[in-house]
Each structure stands twice: as structure tokens, then as C-alpha cells.
Interface confidence: medium
């Protein structure tokens, strides 16, 4: 979690925030937190509320994707008078409350980040004692997960007329640039497909016609690193098969 900027449309920061006699509901979250895959990231969330000295039962919730309706990834509950928020849900055991809801802090830590965690998260607090009230961040915090390239698949496939084509699929954020090298190729970007819908971190490059036997190498590179993998083409000349 690298860069964080405050969302001024959602964060009503002012010097009277702790002393105002009639505090309104507000939530302070940064619009974006950036972190690298494998790291732990913290999603900050603090709030103000109009119920002075509220000490009743409360529930802290984080959801992903969209406010109010997105799936919950974390939930904890604190009993009346208790500062301990007992975890009731932590998706895959990777979400942990760092803030103290009694101190108006719902900050959450996400462990072992993966590219799939790259989405928007929304914090919510619910009061359920003498006071029944709730509030949820509307804009949320976008967790931007970056990752060095990783080649997830490289293969040689038959194509019409006894020809062969090579496919290389890599993931990373920023989406990696792919390049093929091989016999009589030099260094070719080949036919690079845009990231697929629903697979925004995956990029595929195709070599439509492999004309020579030998080793074909796919290289994926972005600002965080590079990765390469190779596939071998050896055709049994005079036969229709190939060994890869």
C-alpha cells in the first residue's frame, strides 16, 4: 500500500471534528491505496457520528465491489462497553481489523495480497443498542494491487494446414508487454490481445504461424520486473505430428 490520497468529497476534515457538540456522520477514507502483490496493505477508515459517548453494541463491516450490496469480506461485533471487536467473518482469513471502532477507527489490514484483491472496498459501522443507526462509506477506497509479470501459460497449438501457432498468456499490473523471440523471428511483439473482460490483468500474445523448428521464448515485462518462458517446436518431417 503505497500511495494514498484523501477523498475530499467523502472526508469532511475540519479542526472541530472532535469537539463539535452535534457531530454528523462522516467517514474518512483515502480514494486509493496502492500495494504490491504478496505484501500486506492497510485500508484506512475513520468516522464521526452524532451519538456522543455511544457505548452500546456495534458491528464493523467491510465489503468489496460496491457499497451497501457488495459481498462482505470482514465483519466483527463488539458487545456493550467492550473495546474488543470479535471477528465473525474474515474472508480466507486474510482480513484483520487494526482500528478500534470505539475510537472511531475501522482501519483494516489485508494480508498476502493477490491481483484478485484489486477492487474497491467500503467500510460500514452499525450501532444496535439504545441507538439504532448505521453509516457506510459511499465512495470507498480503491485497493490497487501491482505485480511483476508472471507467465501463466505458454503453449503450441495446431492450426489449419498442418501449421502451428504459439500462445503466451501473462498476468501483471501494470499489464505486461509481451514479446516473442525465436527462429527467424528476431524480437516480435506478435499479435497481442488486449486484456480480456473480467481478466483485466491477463494479456495474451499469439504467434500465428511457426515456420521453423526450435525454441520460442515469450518475455513479459512491466515496470516491476520481467519474466520469460520457452516452448520448443520439433516437427517430424514427412509426418503430420509435432513434438513440443
Amino acid at each position: 500500500f503505497v500511495r494514498t490520497k484523501i477523498d475530499t468529497t467523502e472526508n469532511l476534515l475540519n479542526t472541530e471534528v472532535h469537539s463539535s457538540p452535534a457531530q454528523r456522520w462522516s467517514m474518512q477514507v483515502p480514494p486509493e491505496v496502492s500495494a504490491e502483490a504478496g505484501d500486506a496493505a492497510v485500508l484506512p477508515c475513520t468516522f464521526t457520528h452524532p451519538h456522543r459517548h455511544y457505548d452500546g453494541p456495534l458491528t464493523a463491516i467491510w465489503r468489496a465491489g460496491e457499497p451497501y450490496a457488495g459481498p462482505q469480506v470482514f465483519r466483527c461485533a463488539a458487545a456493550r462497553g467492550s473495546e474488543l471487536c470479535q471477528t465473525a467473518l474474515s474472508l480466507h482469513g486474510r482480513f484483520r481489523l487494526l482500528g478500534n471502532p470505539r475510537r472511531n477507527d475501522l482501519s483494516l489490514r489485508v494480508e498476502r495480497l493477490a491481483l484478485a484483491d484489486d477492487r474497491r472496498y467500503f467500510c460500514r459501522v452499525e450501532f444496535a443498542g439504545d441507538v439504532h443507526d448505521r453509516y457506510e462509506s459511499r465512495h470507498g477506497v480503491r485497493l490497487h494491487v501491482t505485480a511483476a509479470p508472471r507467465i501463466v501459460n505458454i503453449s503450441v497449438l495446431p492450426s489449419p494446414a498442418h501449421a502451428f501457432r504459439a500462445l503466451c498468456t501473462a498476468e501483471g499490473e501494470p499489464p505486461p508487454a509481451l514479446a516473442w523471440s525465436g527462429p527467424a523471428l528476431g524480437n516480435s511483439l506478435a499479435a497481442v490481445r488486449s486484456p480480456r473482460e473480467g481478466h483485466g490483468h491477463l494479456v495474451t500474445a499469439e504467434l500465428p504461424a511457426l515456420t521453423h523448428d526450435g525454441r520460442y521464448t515469450c518475455t513479459a515485462a512491466n515496470s516491476l520486473g520481467r519474466s520469460e518462458a520457452s516452448v520448443y517446436l520439433f516437427r517430424f518431417h514427412g509426418a503430420s505430428g509435432a513434438s513440443t
Epitope: 500500500f1 503505497v2 500511495r3 494514498t4 490520497k5 484523501i6 475530499t8 472526508n11 476534515l13 474518512q28 483515502p30 491505496v33 500495494a35 505484501d39 500486506a40 496493505a41 492497510v42 484506512p44 475513520t46 474488543l84 471487536c85 484483520r96 481489523l97 487494526l98 482500528g99 478500534n100 475510537r103 477507527d105 482501519s107 489490514r109 494480508e111 498476502r112
Partner: antibody
Framework: QVQLQESGPGLVKPSETLSLTCTVS????????VHWVRQPPGKGLEWIVL???????TYNSALKSRVTISKDTSKNQVSLKLSSVTAADTAVYYC?????????????????WGQGTLVTVSS | DIQMTQSPSSLSASVGDRVTITCKAS??????LAWYQQKPGKAPKLLIS???SLETGVPSRFSGSGSGTDYTFTISSLQPEDIATYYC?????????FGGGTKVEIK
């Protein structure tokens, strides 16, 4: 009482790997995180990395490609490795305790510090 | 990254004077600010967290205030033992960043 002590070679050659150890006492690495911070001579402070109580890590992205942090809870030690060093890595390196690791607030402060160890990068 | 701009970089004051140091963040940091004191040849010492909360054992002449992007550290009555460099640090956003420091000397 809480104490942290950095140790390691005071001189490292350019392009080599700097290795430092922080030995702690008065608290358990199972319950507290540890930061590494450095300070070039006559300059300000630069945060490097935090290892949380459960072993998770959070790095300064500007240094992450060269930094490795690990810990041995049973030995009360946290180690830092910085690869491919240059003269710009000459600094006093501090380890410091992260005080609110376990559910009392996301406060990235450093409440206890070691005395620091000077590492000079020179051939 | 959030930049922390501290001023002045150095100051000289008399014993008993009121000393004020300011720290400006390049973006809102929601009061998640700490102040440290570093005496020559020593490690930094945490004085204040949460922009205003004095750490246990820190003399009450030290105080902090501010909100949003602008924060202030005050020594109400400078003492000889306060000769040091003072740093602010934000922890709202990783990477954690420090101000450039303010060196306080006695006239």
C-alpha cells in the same frame, strides 16, 4: 525494559548485500511488529520496511526490489538484507518497535528505537 | 507518496521561549501524524502521536495541534535539554514519510 539492538558489519563493498540483525528484549515479536528506518549522515529519516507480528510485510516501494526482511521469533531477532548497495546506502540503520500492531489502532509510529548502527558502503 | 515539508529547518531561541515548528503534508493525513525528538548521536524518540496525543513520560511543555494538511509542534518554554532535531512523520499512507527535520538550538 524494552530494548532493540542493531548489529552487522560497519563496512560493505559496492554491489554487495548489506545484512543487519535487530535483537529485541522486553517484548515478544509474536505481539509486536518491527520497522527498519535509515538516516544518511547529516540527513533526515527514511522508512524502509515493517514486518508485522504475524510475519506479514509492508515495504517502501522505492526500496522493495532490494530489500528482504525476516524474523526468528524464538531468537527475538529481525533481519534486514539490502542488495546491490551503493554509496547512497551509507547510513545509520535503526530498528524500531511498532507499538500498536495488534488491534488498538493503525498507528505507524515507532515507540522504541535501537541506538542505530552505521553502515558505510565503500570499496 | 505524501511529502512532509517541515519549517523552519533550524531555529535558535532562548531558554524559556516558546518554540513553534510547522509540518505541512502534500495531502490530507487525517491527523495521523507523529513528532519525534532526536538528540545528537542518539536514536529518535516518539513524543506525540495522533497529532496531539503526548506519549507517557513526555513533559507537558511539548504539544501538538493541527488538522488536514497543516500541523504544529510547540515547546511552550524551551529548556536546555530540548536541544535536538525534531521530525514529523505521517502514517496515513505508506510509504511512511518524515519531514526534513528542524534543528533547535539555544541562543
Amino acid at each position: 525494559q524494552v530494548q532493540l539492538q542493531e548489529s552487522g558489519p560497519g563496512l560493505v563493498k559496492p554491489s554487495e548485500t548489506l545484512s543487519l540483525t535487530c535483537t529485541v528484549s522486553g517484548f515478544s515479536l509474536s505481539n509486536y511488529g518491527v520497522h527498519w528506518v535509515r538516516q544518511p549522515p547529516g540527513k533526515g529519516l527514511e522508512w524502509i520496511v515493517l514486518i508485522w507480528s504475524d510475519g506479514s510485510t509492508t515495504y517502501n516501494s522505492a526500496l522493495k526490489s532490494r530489500v528482504t526482511i525476516s524474523k526468528d521469533t524464538s531468537k527475538n531477532q529481525v533481519s534486514l538484507k539490502l542488495s546491490s548497495v551503493t554509496a547512497a546506502d551509507t547510513a545509520v540503520y535503526y530498528c524500531a518497535r511498532h507499538p500498536y500492531d495488534d488491534y488498538s489502532g493503525y498507528y505507524y509510529t515507532m515507540d522504541y528505537w535501537g541506538q542505530g548502527t552505521l553502515v558505510t558502503v565503500s570499496s | 507518496d505524501i511529502q512532509m515539508t517541515q519549517s523552519p529547518s533550524s531555529l535558535s531561541a532562548s531558554v524559556g521561549d516558546r518554540v513553534t515548528i510547522t509540518c505541512k503534508a502534500s495531502d490530507h493525513i487525517n491527523n495521523w501524524l507523529a513528532w519525534y525528538q532526536q538528540k545528537p548521536g542518539k536514536a529518535p524518540k516518539l513524543l506525540i502521536s495522533g497529532a496531539t496525543s503526548l506519549e507517557t513520560g513526555v513533559p507537558s511543555r511539548f504539544s501538538g495541534s493541527g488538522s488536514g494538511t497543516d500541523y504544529t509542534f510547540t515547546i511552550s518554554s524551551l529548556q536546555p535539554e530540548d536541544i535536538a532535531t525534531y521530525y514529523c512523520q505521517q502514517y496515513w499512507s505508506s510509504p511512511l514519510t518524515f519531514g526534513g527535520g528542524t534543528k533547535v538550538e539555544i541562543k
